[in-house]
């Protein structure tokens, strides 16, 4: 029941893999709202192709918990981290001159797509196991922000605070439909 208001799970990082940021309250609509449908807004400074910009994708492996229950296996999650910059500058950008114009757009590294993954949760005291689908970040992107973006939008860009788009395959109009019926016809 707790998932509706808060993600009720401990941050249990596998030793040696660093600390994972605690997720935000889930019903904070401002924090979770994506702007522009995940597409970068038009801006006159859009001189470079987005592919020239890159941002850091950090992988964390940890167990997920739901109340007293813990995932049977660790799950690898992706966190979008750091400032965006031209890909060639990223490996050693510390100390470099700021490459964007002072009044130009700011670029932030945010989740782009997510995927759903089935997770089996084991519960203590002989309680029945649980099965859940967890939403995980699948990739990150650089999104242009300008000084005209409002404050609520700026809240979106801490790790794990902005909800990314679904991991949709490219589509001109309709998305492709899954044709394989075998799973349903021969289910379990």
């Amino acid at each position: 029941q707790g998932w509706q208001a808060f993600r009720n799970d401990a941050t249990e990082v596998i030793p040696g893999l660093g600390e994972y940021p605690e997720p935000p309250p889930e019903n904070n609509q401002t924090m979770n709202r994506a702007e522009n449908g995940g597409r970068p807004p038009h801006h006159p400074y859009d001189a470079k192709d987005v592919s020239e910009y890159s941002c850091r994708e950090l992988h964390y492996t940890r167990f997920l918990t739901d109340g007293p229950c813990r995932s049977a296996k660790p799950v690898t999650e992706l966190v979008c981290s750091g400032q965006c910059g031209p890909a060639r500058l990223l490996p050693n950008a510390i100390g470099r001159v700021k490459w964007w114009r002072p009044n130009g757009p700011d670029f932030r590294c945010i989740p782009d797509r997510y995927r759903a993954q089935r997770v089996q949760l084991l519960c203590p005291g002989g309680a029945a196991p649980r099965s859940r689908k967890v939403r995980l970040v699948a990739s990150c992107k650089c999104k242009r922000l300008t000084r005209f973006h409002n404050q609520s939008e700026l809240k979106d860009f801490g790790p794990e605070t902005a909800r990314p788009q679904k991991g949709r395959k490219p589509r001109p109009g309709a998305r492709g439909a899954k044709a394989n019926q075998a799973e349903l016809e021969n289910a379990y």
Epitope: G38, Y114, R130, S131, K133, E183, L184, A187
Partner: antibody, heavy 121, light 109 residues
Framework: EVQLVQSGAEVKKPGASVKVSCKVS????????MHWVRQAPGKGLEWMGG????????IYAQKFQGRVTMTEDTSTDTAYMELSSLRSEDTAVYYC??????????????WGQGTLVTVSS | QAVVTQEPSLTVSPGGTVTLTCGSS?????????PYWFQQKPGQAPRTLIS???DKHSWTPARFSGSLLGGKAALTLSGAQPEDEAEYYC?????????FGGGTKLTVL
Amino acid sequence: EVQLVQSGAEVKKPGASVKVSCKVSGYTLTELSMHWVRQAPGKGLEWMGGFDPEDGETIYAQKFQGRVTMTEDTSTDTAYMELSSLRSEDTAVYYCATDTVGYWEKFFQHWGQGTLVTVSS
Amino acid sequence: QAVVTQEPSLTVSPGGTVTLTCGSSTGTVTIDHYPYWFQQKPGQAPRTLISDTDDKHSWTPARFSGSLLGGKAALTLSGAQPEDEAEYYCLLDYGGRFVFGGGTKLTVL
């Protein structure tokens, strides 16, 4: 809070097509997994299809395969369900339903008000 | 295609307890079918009571609970109220394809 507002009632002739819309507010459509469910008068609920975030595709129920198309206009945050080759037995209330924005994936949490489609000659 | 079965109708006395079940033609219902339960009243859209077997929602009254029972998904109503009179549907997930049960008409009298 996700809110779904559907288009108005439609009357169609057999063999025609109908396109029902579902406008999302509160979140953007790309954040959500949209599904379509119908209910014939006095009958039960029937899943028609929807977006599966596990593989990033729209899946259709076998019964409707080839006759239904689910599309999205992300610029207006509107989802569409088009059903072709209508027959009298397609007379039903058509619902759009979407998941909740949360860490665990939960489908069918928010429902549109329904669109009555009547197929009659 | 899988067929999901429910009791067509059940009756419970006010304050009483009743269990609705949801079976699958493909065999035992497990947590990997992520059973959902919906309540629908006449002229209204359905509303979700339970997701993923037993997960209640903020709006779900405490008297409703979900579980697996004898190879089926189950919805138990303890302390039935007159306003619980409605149609109840279960839904099972078959690898991304969903199938609704035929519904159970619950009468409280």
